[in-house]
Interface confidence: medium
Amino acid sequence: FPQDRPFEDTCHGNPSHYYDKAVRRCCYRCPMGLFPTQQCPQRPTDCRKQCEPDYYLDEADRCTACVTCSRDDLVEKTPCAWNSSRVCECRPGMFCSTSAVNSCARCFFHSVCPAGMIVKFPGTAQKNTVCEPASPGVSPACASPENCKEPSSGTIPQAKPTPVSPATSSASTMPVRGGTRLAQEAASKLTRAPDSPSSVGRPSSDPGLSPTQPCPEGSGDCRKQCEPDYYLDEAGRCTACVSCSRDDLVEKTPCAWNSSRTCECRPGMICATSATNSCARCVPYPICAAETVTKPQDMAEKDTTFEAPPLGTQPDCNPTPENGEAPASTSPTQSLLVDSQASKTLPIPTSAPVALSSTGKPVLDAG
């Protein structure tokens, strides 16, 4: 592009600028210790300082500690980035009753709809399950009309009447206090994301390309420096690589300078709800449970509600789906794997106190 040559020439001999062939213009070279906030900085104000690991640059240009999701009832929603805090939310199966900045101060288990009620809105990390009366002609066993099929479809009738509205009855939900490890964690294996980033893979950007080690004058090989664990997307923006820090995920491909990390379910698990470059929900495979079943959930951000099956029922245990598809396509409507120890302490949200019998089955404690 001959018309661009004059611009390129003006960069030569000017140590504070370099020519970026990608954008075909002169760019300001950020000084030592400073990093560009855009692909082609034009002035010193387009450069920023780097905060320490687990710190982010707030609106006042101060390095502020990212919140940690180290409590048992929290998981990482978004990672700690250069300009924003890590965000924590209640782990699947729980909702936030007392919010905190970028986190939640108190998480409660989702309520289970009582007999004669059906789920109107499934619980999320922010909201409890909302129930509504079953409409006439629809079996109370159906969570929604589209799920009212023959029992062979895997739908299990709801059990154990429990109050629903957190506004009227705080006793209907069970908080996790003092880091107590509840068996729901053992059953679902959905533990917290670690505070420290994954050490798997390689740095998302090559320190040799950092503006602290200026690129050769006029070099087109000097690409934008993204933060650790970020990649340069097609639009030239630094985008966070997905995190495989959930217990049920493993890294398939690492975070590279121009592509995201990809995650897949760990061995022995299959993806029930896919997500970009990752899996929103992994379930064990084969999927057999002795005492616990899950309600089907379609939306990735909506959480599974754990329930006890009605007495005398037992979910099917099929090593392979009935339609003969590969495990990856297995429906998430089957139950999660629970070992005999975990089933002894499975929380059953209920308005009455719960005791555990010697058999490990929850029993209602009348007082």
Partner: antibody
């Protein structure tokens, strides 16, 4: 040449305060972070904290919160460490150091010669 | 806080031989695939001097006799061949988590 020039030795009484200085040459302190490190006689190194001279943003080791105050003046290219309510435990050499920060590295690349503080009645 | 444990506390090596100093962290200091561990040399009456940063990168001006290795929680500094000028205290330091912490130090002596 990049250098950090620290103020001279101090002999102070218990309960008093002292303010140490660290003047940079060869670079602008507002483009970096300035750290302070403590070293007691015949002992290891302890990180006290750091300041972003561009805006006064500080981070301290909780063990030094209340004991140490780090400030900086970009006009004089100088960082300061003030130590209050001094006791014999504060007798040490105090170093200032430049923090070098990158995409995958954070370290002290330039150190001052140190200032000896002796607390004695 | 991340605690760094250096071993040995003192080390006597013959000239021309190899000296190995270890540093173990109480938790991982990895950050996106890089171990945020540094090594410093300190001679009596002098400030510490940076030798190695990010586990294995040799600071400019430092002799190639100094090498760093390790990942996760275990790191080491190797000096080979050891020279008279290497008599000093050596400290490891992590910058993975605030507060940044140092190891207790290893005193290198010549046999």
């Amino acid at each position: 040449e990049v250098q950090l020039q620290q103020s001279g030795a101090e002999l102070v009484k218990p309960g008093a305060s002292v303010k140490l200085s660290c003047t940079a040459s060869g670079f602008n302190i507002k483009d970096t972070y300035m750290h302070w490190v403590k070293q007691r006689p015949e002992q290891g190194l302890e990180w006290i904290g750091r300041i972003d001279p561009a805006n006064g943003d500080t981070i301290y080791d909780p063990n030094f919160q209340g004991k140490a105050t780090i400030t900086a003046y970009t006009s004089s290219n100088t960082a300061y460490l003030q130590l209050s309510s001094l006791t014999s435990e504060d007798t040490a050499v105090y170093y200032c150091a430049r923090g070098y920060y990158g995409s995958s590295y954070w370290y002290f690349d330039v150190w001052g010669a140190g200032t000896t503080v002796t607390v004695s009645s | 806080d991340i605690v760094l444990t250096q071993s040995p506390a003192s080390l006597a090596v013959s000239l021309g031989q190899r000296a190995t100093i270890s540093c173990r962290a109480s938790e991982s200091v990895e950050y996106y695939g890089t171990g945020l561990m540094q090594w410093y040399q300190q001679k009596p009456g002098q400030p510490p001097k940076l030798l190695i940063y990010s586990a294995s990168n040799v600071e400019s001006g430092v002799p190639a006799r100094f090498t760093g290795s390790g990942s996760g929680t275990d790191f080491s500094l190797n000096i080979h061949p050891v020279e008279e000028d290497d008599i000093a205290m050596y400290f490891c330091q992590q910058s993975r988590k605030v507060p940044w912490t140092f190891g207790g130090g290893t005193k290198l002596e010549i046999k």
